[in-house]
């Protein structure tokens, strides 16, 4: 999906008012310095591409993030503020239903959510120069 035509300010508002705290709660008990940010993004569409990938695509050691509250809210926000997003996701969901995993919090998942927090922070500050 091409995130170029999303309403970025509305997505930012959704993140600040309904998503960010759930990421913090997921990470509770973890030191903020525990994980290094290795995933970065250069602009808002790129950030959303990376956020979508890390949130919804199962990875080795962390297969269950897509079932977390913050993931559901992300899915809902993208569907509302990214034209055509919901249509492109319907087929993807049918495939995902076949490999539904139970929610498990592993160290790898914590690392992945830490990366997500960094991506969202970058998304919210698009005018900052890339480090």
């Amino acid at each position: 999906y091409d995130f170029t035509n999303c309403d970025f300010e509305k997505i930012k508002a959704a993140y600040l008012s309904t998503i960010s705290k759930d990421l913090i709660t997921y990470m509770s008990g973890t030191k903020s310095t525990e994980f290094n940010n290795t995933v970065s993004c250069s602009n808002r569409p790129h950030c959303l591409t990376e956020i979508q990938s890390l949130t919804f695509n199962p990875t080795a050691g962390c297969a269950s993030l897509a079932k977390e509250m913050f993931a559901m809210k992300t899915k809902a926000a993208l569907a509302i503020w990214c034209p055509g997003y919901s249509e492109t996701q319907i087929n993807a969901t049918q495939a995902m239903k076949k490999r539904r995993k139970r929610k498990v919090t592993t160290n790898k998942c914590l690392e992945q959510v830490s990366q997500l927090q960094g991506l969202w922070r970058r998304f919210n500050r698009p005018l900052l120069k890339q480090q």
Partner: antibody
Framework: QVQLVESGGGLVQPGGSLRLSCAAS????????MSWVRQAPGKGLEWVSG???????YYADSVKGRFTISRDNSKNTLYLQMNSLRAEDTAVYYC???????????WGQGTLVTVSS | DIELTQPPSVSVAPGQTARISCGGD??????VYWYQQKPGQAPVLVIY???KRPSGIPERFSGSNSGNTATLTISGTQAEDEADYYC???????????FGGGTKLTVL
């Protein structure tokens, strides 16, 4: 303007079935997570069920296995099929637009379901 | 699912400040929403994301949330604020929406 209009409520005997409909207008229905919330007479609000644009569904434990939520995005309509109805299901049923999956920003006017013999 | 606890009733004199509490285990780690419902009407969202007001909601409505308690505050309460108020959050395991039992606000 944004509007949700419920229909299909009425009197039904215990063990019976009823299908509620909700016609949505004024917004891109197919993009939103939609839900049903009920309110028994003189009681508080109880979330019943919700459904994503892609058909992913969620249910309250009190209705799981008896109620089925569905939607027809081409008709901008939300449904609630209620089977094996009990007296405790008597309530006003509200159709609701659930913003960002976690709160309700638009409510319908409600339709009354009475389960009684 | 988590349980949200509200006082059944709160009374306030016109022009005074009304505070309605909503208690729940580690509630501060989740977002809380508040709805106003007048007799015979559907609920109306008055606070979202703990403390934000939707457009059209008067400035006298405010919200906070920390620890195990969220609070809806109505400053300079008016007669038209008399209604039932419901807090709402969600369960992080089931992902279900959860409502408090509701508080009847009476303006004396």
């Amino acid at each position: 303007q944004v509007q949700l209009v419920e229909s299909g409520g009425g009197l039904v005997q215990p063990g019976g079935s009823l299908r509620l409909s909700c016609a949505a207008s004024g917004f891109t229905f197919s993009s939103y997570y939609m839900s049903w919330v009920r309110q028994a007479p003189g009681k508080g609000l109880e979330w019943v069920s919700g459904i994503f644009f892609d058909g992913t569904t969620y249910y309250a434990d009190s209705v799981k296995g008896r109620f089925t939520i569905s939607r027809d995005n081409s008709k901008n309509t939300l449904y609630l099929q209620m089977n094996s109805l009990r007296a405790e299901d008597t309530a006003v049923y509200y159709c609701a637009r659930q913003q960002y999956f976690d709160h309700i920003d638009i409510w319908g006017q409600g339709t009354l379901v009475t389960v009684s013999s | 699912d988590i349980e949200l606890t509200q006082p059944p009733s709160v009374s306030v004199a016109p022009g005074q400040t009304a505070r309605i509490s909503c208690g729940g285990d580690s509630l501060g780690g989740k977002y809380v929403y508040w709805y106003q419902q007048k007799p015979g009407q559907a609920p109306v969202l008055v606070i979202y994301g703990d403390s934000k007001r939707p457009s059209g909601i008067p400035e006298r409505f405010s919200g906070s949330n920390s620890g195990n308690t969220a609070t809806l505050t109505i400053s300079g309460t008016q007669a038209e604020d008399e209604a039932d108020y419901y807090c709402q959050s969600y369960d992080l395991k089931s992902l279900n929406v959860v409502f408090g039992g509701g508080t009847k606000l009476t303006v004396l």
